[in-house]
């Protein structure tokens, strides 16, 4: 009954604060209306980092200001999250909930680890 | 802080309605699924209804579908439970609760009792 | 529907000592979907355990949560006076929502 949701363990952001994972999940059932929610747990804390509801079969739509844009297919959700600095560094949660048809289920991987690096300041040219 | 609060409760005939209110402050209501939950005097804990983060999806219990409607107002942060063609056996405490990012409920209201009798 | 059964019905102990309480499953519940609470007489019950085993925030380390599967526990390892409640797990993996009969611990 209870449903798996697989993402990688660890994600590497490029130079410009941006990090991508795939975030699958096993539906148990045919879901036409899914919800997926990136979550950032630091310590015991949990916080949303971004959410987006889609209708199977069309696109993520994420909130004008969210820091989040995604594409869907089938059961895979590809996540990218930009804007990242090195204190963002830390476990992205993806939940998944099948909000219909009934009956309703959530799932909740593992997390993927998103390390940042900020980049070197450019020298200065003589 | 995290603040749920119920209203609505009381003494109800047979066959009448009722409208529970659930007053939420302390986060951002709109981002949280919410449920209600009854206590039956001296019973158990019973799940009754969960509702979607925009009021789209609705979730009811066996025993209380086609007679309760739970729904929400996000501008008002406030849940509602709406009882109708009550029984003697609706009798209970109902809590709201909020359901946590990772899925328990982690605060609920005091609960207000609502009492079926003739 | 996931029925949960808990058991023993109420167990009786002294200040001090191990608490063990049971609750199984009727089918499999991940981990991350089973919960515990605690409600004492006349409040709302209170989140202990989430995920099976993590604690709430602000719950002291003496209770404990394991399990997987079909079968879960929940340890109290040294019973304080304000421990004597009822306690009941839940799962939120799928609906419906489904919380066990409960378990009451009271003072020998």
């Known amino acids: 009954k209870a449903m798996h949701v697989a993402q990688p363990a660890v994600v590497l952001a490029n130079s410009r604060g941006t990090a991508s994972f795939v975030c699958e999940y096993a539906s148990p059932g045919k879901a036409t209306e899914v919800r997926v929610t990136v979550l950032r747990q630091a310590d015991s804390q949990v916080t949303e980092v971004c959410a987006a509801t889609y209708m199977m079969g069309n696109e993520l739509t994420f909130l004008d200001d969210s820091i989040c844009t995604g594409t869907s297919s089938g059961n895979q959700v590809n996540l990218t999250i930009q804007g990242l600095r090195a204190m963002d560094t830390g476990l992205y949660i993806c939940k998944v909930e099948l909000m219909y048809p009934p009956p309703y289920y959530m799932g909740i991987g593992n997390g993927t680890q998103i390390y940042v690096i900020d980049p070197e300041p450019c020298p200065d040219s003589d | 802080q995290v603040q749920l609060v119920e209203s609505g409760g009381g003494v109800v005939q047979p066959g009448r309605s009722l409208r529970l209110s659930c007053a939420a402050s302390g986060f951002t209501f709109s981002h949280y699924t919410m449920h209600w939950v009854r206590q039956a005097p001296g019973k158990g804990l019973e799940w009754v209804t969960f509702i979607s983060y925009d009021g789209h999806n609705k979730y009811y219990a066996d025993s209380v579908k086609g007679r309760f409607t739970i729904s929400r107002d996000n501008s008002k942060n406030t849940l509602y439970l709406q009882m109708n063609s009550l029984r003697a056996e609706d009798t209970a405490i109902y809590y709201c609760?909020?359901?946590?990012?990772?899925?328990?409920?982690?605060?609920w209201g005091q609960g207000t009792l609502v009492t079926v009798s003739s | 529907e996931i029925v949960l059964t808990q058991s023993p019905g109420t167990l009786s102990l002294s200040p001090g000592e191990r608490a063990t309480l049971s609750c199984r499953a009727s089918q499999e519940v991940g981990e991350s979907y089973l919960a515990w609470y605690q409600q004492k007489p006349g409040q709302a019950p209170r989140l202990l355990i989430y995920g099976a085993f993590s604690r709430a925030t602000g719950i002291p380390d003496r209770f404990s949560g394991s399990g997987s599967g079909t079968d879960f526990t929940l340890t109290i390892s040294r019973l304080e006076p304000e421990d004597f409640a009822v306690y009941y797990c839940q799962q939120y993996g799928s609906s419906p929502w489904t919380f066990g009969q409960g378990t009451k611990v009271e003072i020998k």
């Open positions: 609760a909020r359901t946590g990012w990772l899925g328990p409920f982690d605060y």
